[in-house]
């Protein structure tokens, strides 16, 4: 029959090659000459040429040694054709199974494996898993079946069998109690992997087991008693550093100390923190100590670790005796910050207030006073009594020195101790407003058209406080009311300025008097630029031929003509004419275009 059973070929065959494996035979060879061929991976496709066939005999040939670890099975097709090339059989499956030889040693996946386990753990605790691979077959043979074992352990303390390894999984576990990091921090195991399930080739590797720290050592004070001297009143003063030793891993939570004051600090005067580098307890004052109240404190300090203890351990306690040293204390102003109401503008020499300090020391010390900071130089202070008087004019509206009606002064008290000490106090003068400022309009320069002019709204400001401000009243003075009107709005905080008669293009002064609710009057001159235009304007259109200064000049054009015609004499004429024109400016403007202005205003 045109069938071939699976062919088993051992890997790593010695040859000689080509090696005959099996003969393909078609029973059609009785009728015609048959030519045989094979196809498939290993024959005519990669890896080409592993197998061949003798075309006329049908012998299947192996051309080279096989490697099961590279290709474990080849699937080929056998073909039979007659002399004329016609196929005489269907393609036949040829299975070539490569059988395994134990040609590979086990290989550990790492040269060195690293694992860790907590000190003091119970036997049976898993540490780590090691792995060795073997490329040989582990399904049909034992060639690739790996068995693990521990060859040696270093050090052999407390004895030489602290660990075991599972022969098939490679899991390393603790087998004995007594792991103590403080005695043996690390074990080095030489491990073996042997194929043929322990009867074949062996390879070795190293497993390093780190013993992890458990908090099985309490911190201990060295020494246990401390004595310290601290000046009174100092906050944040380092009183004492307390030192501990701990056998656990430095800088770990099991080593880092946590300190607590467990007695002797009823007034909550002290705090203790852990120094991050030295692990010492740094005892400092949280509040100033008062020698006069208590000259000695006996503190009890307990130490634990950041991490809880892994086993039951005693807690260490230290005693710190703190002696308070007397110091000359500074006088203290009562209150430290004093608020006084005083009217602005009071006469020089007028008393403002008395501001005194007390000395905490038991001795009756003499206190003298002086002003430390008085930005405007408005005050003086009696050195003996602490009486504060005005020596300058207190001005609430002085924005350089006064903020939100308050003028701030710093005063100093000095005792006569040895050495003398000083204390400061803050005097906050709340200045009461008086009506010492009149209202002022903003802006003080306007530009307006002389035809269909737009009303100019000016804001009114008054530096004083209510009721010395709005409502305001407005009045035009110095004949300004001939050409202008000024009206205060309903709210009384703006004034509306309007041009009521035609004025030629020029600059004019409008005299505006404003008074506040307390009848404080303020005269302001508004500079009005009148332009030849209609409605709203920002700047005058066209070439500006405005006059000079407050009066302005109406004779610019004439002056130019006169200069052209007469030369030197023209200068004198121009001066004369200019002066006359300037004086008669408002009258000339009125006569010139009275008719046109009349039409505009009526419109």
């Amino acid at each position: 029959d045109w069938v071939v059973a699976p062919i088993s070929v051992p890997e790593n065959g010695k040859g000689p090659f080509p090696q005959r494996l099996n003969q393909l035979k078609s029973n059609k060879d009785r009728d015609t000459k048959i030519f045989y061929s094979i196809t498939g991976p290993g024959a005519d496709s990669p890896p080409e040429g592993v197998f061949a066939v003798e075309k006329e005999t049908g012998w299947l040939l192996l051309n080279k040694p096989l490697d099961r670890e590279e290709i474990a099975k080849y699937e080929l097709f056998g073909h039979a054709v007659s002399e004329n090339g016609a196929s005489v059989e269907d393609p036949m499956n040829i299975s070539i199974i490569v059988t395994d030889q134990n040609d590979h040693k086990p290989k550990f996946t790492q040269d060195t494996f690293r694992g860790s386990v907590l000190e003091g753990v119970l036997p049976g605790t898993s540490v780590m898993q090691v792995t060795a691979t073997d490329e040989d077959d582990a399904i049909y043979t034992y060639n690739g079946v790996v068995a693990y074992s521990i060859h040696s352990q270093e050090p052999k303390d407390p004895h030489d069998l602290m660990f075991t390894i599972h022969r098939s999984t490679g899991t390393i576990s603790v087998i004995s109690s007594g792991l103590d990091r403080e005695k043996v921090p690390e074990y080095t195991l030489t491990i073996q992997a042997t194929d043929m399930d322990g009867d074949g080739s062996t390879t070795t590797a190293v497993a390093v087991v780190e013993i992890l720290d458990a908090n099985d050592n309490a911190p201990m004070f060295e020494p246990q008693k401390y004595e310290a001297w601290v000046p009174e009143n100092e906050v944040g003063h380092e009183v004492q550093r307390l030192t501990v030793t701990d056998l656990d891993v430095p800088n770990s939570p099991a080593w880092r100390a946590t300190y607590h004051i467990v007695g002797g600090d009823d007034g909550d005067h002290f705090t203790i923190t852990t120094h991050p580098e030295t692990n010492q307890g740094v005892l400092t004052t949280k509040k100033g100590l008062d020698f006069e109240a208590q000259d000695q404190h006996t503190l009890y300090v307990e130490v634990t670790n950041e991490a809880p203890f892994a086993v039951k351990l005693p807690t260490a306690t230290a005693t710190v005796v703190v002696h308070v040293k007397d110091v000359n204390e500074a006088p203290v102003f009562v209150p430290p910050s004093k608020v006084v109401e005083v009217q602005e503008g009071i006469p020089t020499g007028e008393p403002v207030c008395v501001y005194t300090a007390e000395d905490p020391d038991k001795e009756n010390q003499k206190i003298s006073y002086r002003i430390l900071r008085d930005p405007a130089g408005w005050l003086a202070m009696d050195p003996d009594s602490g009486q504060v008087t005005a020596v300058g004019t207190l001005d609430r509206e002085d924005e350089q020195f006064v903020r939100n009606n308050i003028y701030e002064v710093m005063v100093l008290a000095m005792d006569n101790g040895s050495p003398p000490t000083t204390g400061t106090g803050t005097l906050l003068l709340t200045l009461i407003d008086v009506n010492d400022h009149g209202p002022v309009p903003e802006p003080r320069q306007i530009t307006i058209c002389n035809q269909s002019p737009v009303r100019q709204v000016l804001n009114i400001t008054d530096k004083d406080l209510s009721p010395h401000t709005s409502p305001f009243q407005a009045q035009l003075t110095d004949d300004s009311d001939i050409y202008w009107t000024a009206e205060v709005n309903e709210e009384g905080d703006t004034v509306v300025l309007s041009l009521k008669k035609f004025l030629k293009q020029d600059t004019y002064d409008v005299h505006l008097s404003l008074s506040d609710h307390g009848n404080k009057e303020q005269l302001t001159v508004i500079r009005a630029t009148v332009c030849d235009c209609h409605g709203h304007v920002e700047t005058c259109p066209g070439p500006w031929k405005g006059g000079s200064g407050g009066g302005g000049s109406g004779a610019g054009v004439i002056a130019v003509i006169v200069v052209v015609v007469i030369a030197i004499v023209a200068g004198i004429v121009v001066l004369v004419i200019s002066r006359k024109k300037r004086m008669a400016k408002y009258e000339k403007a009125e006569i010139k275009e009275m008719g046109e202005m009349h039409r505009e205003l009526n419109a």
Partner: antibody, heavy 121, light 107 residues
């Protein structure tokens, strides 16, 4: 065993074709592979391809696919190689060489005397 | 394509001397290596196949060795008729490839 390349030296024009023959005697022609090898003047040997006359199976060097066509006539025990679209690069001596069938892994044990092909206009 | 590297490219020797020619394959060809001798204007002649088997009628002063990728042809006691060009050839995988040749000349 004897391989005789019967066609004498060939002088052909570029673009033309030439067919070289190789007559075998002294062995079973249809049961051995016939190889063809090219040698340019002063150069080494270059394998073109082979044919198994028994069933006409061919195998070519990729470089000569489309250039060389191998055929065999069992009745006259003659192998042929046709070279097409000739250029000056095809000017060479062409050898036929027998290879016994042993899974086609045998060396070429008998060689023809060679046919010289010159391509020139 | 498998590359065959032959060395030396040329070699001068005297009659009676022993010479060795080497051939390196770019991949494993096991023992499938042949050596040929070609004289000027003649066709190549098979000397050795399967790396070390001498072809019929080849004198025993010729010997082949090697396997895998490294091969050599040794000629003991050179004779005048041994001068010519020698080629190695892979007869394992197609395309069959030849070395570039070693030209052996009389010193």
């Amino acid at each position: 065993v004897q391989l005789v390349e019967e066609s004498g030296p060939e002088l052909v024009k570029p673009g033309a074709s030439v067919k070289i023959s190789c007559k075998a005697s002294g062995y079973a022609f249809s049961s051995s592979w016939m190889n063809w090898v090219k040698q340019r003047p002063g150069k080494g040997l270059e394998w073109i391809g082979r044919i198994y006359p028994g069933d006409g199976e061919t195998k070519y060097n990729g470089k000569f696919k489309g250039k060389a066509t191998l055929t065999a006539d069992k009745s006259s025990s003659t192998a042929y190689m046709q070279l097409s679209s000739l250029t000056s690069e095809d000017s060479a001596v062409y050898f036929c060489a027998r290879q016994r069938d042993y899974g086609a892994l045998y060396a070429m044990d008998y060689w023809g005397q060679g046919t010289s092909v010159t391509v020139s206009s | 394509e498998l590359v065959m590297t032959q060395s030396p490219a040329s070699l001068s020797a005297s009659v009676g001397e022993t010479v060795t020619i080497t051939c390196r394959a770019s991949d494993d060809i096991y023992s499938y290596l042949a050596w040929y001798q070609q004289k000027q204007g003649k066709s190549p002649q098979l000397l050795v196949y399967n790396a070390k088997t001498l072809a019929e009628g080849v004198p025993s002063r010729f010997s082949g060795s090697g396997s895998g990728t490294q091969f050599s042809l040794k000629i003991n006691s050179l004779q005048p008729e041994d001068f010519g060009t020698y080629y190695c050839q892979n007869h394992y995988v197609t395309p069959f490839t030849f070395g570039a040749g070693t030209k052996l000349e009389i010193k």
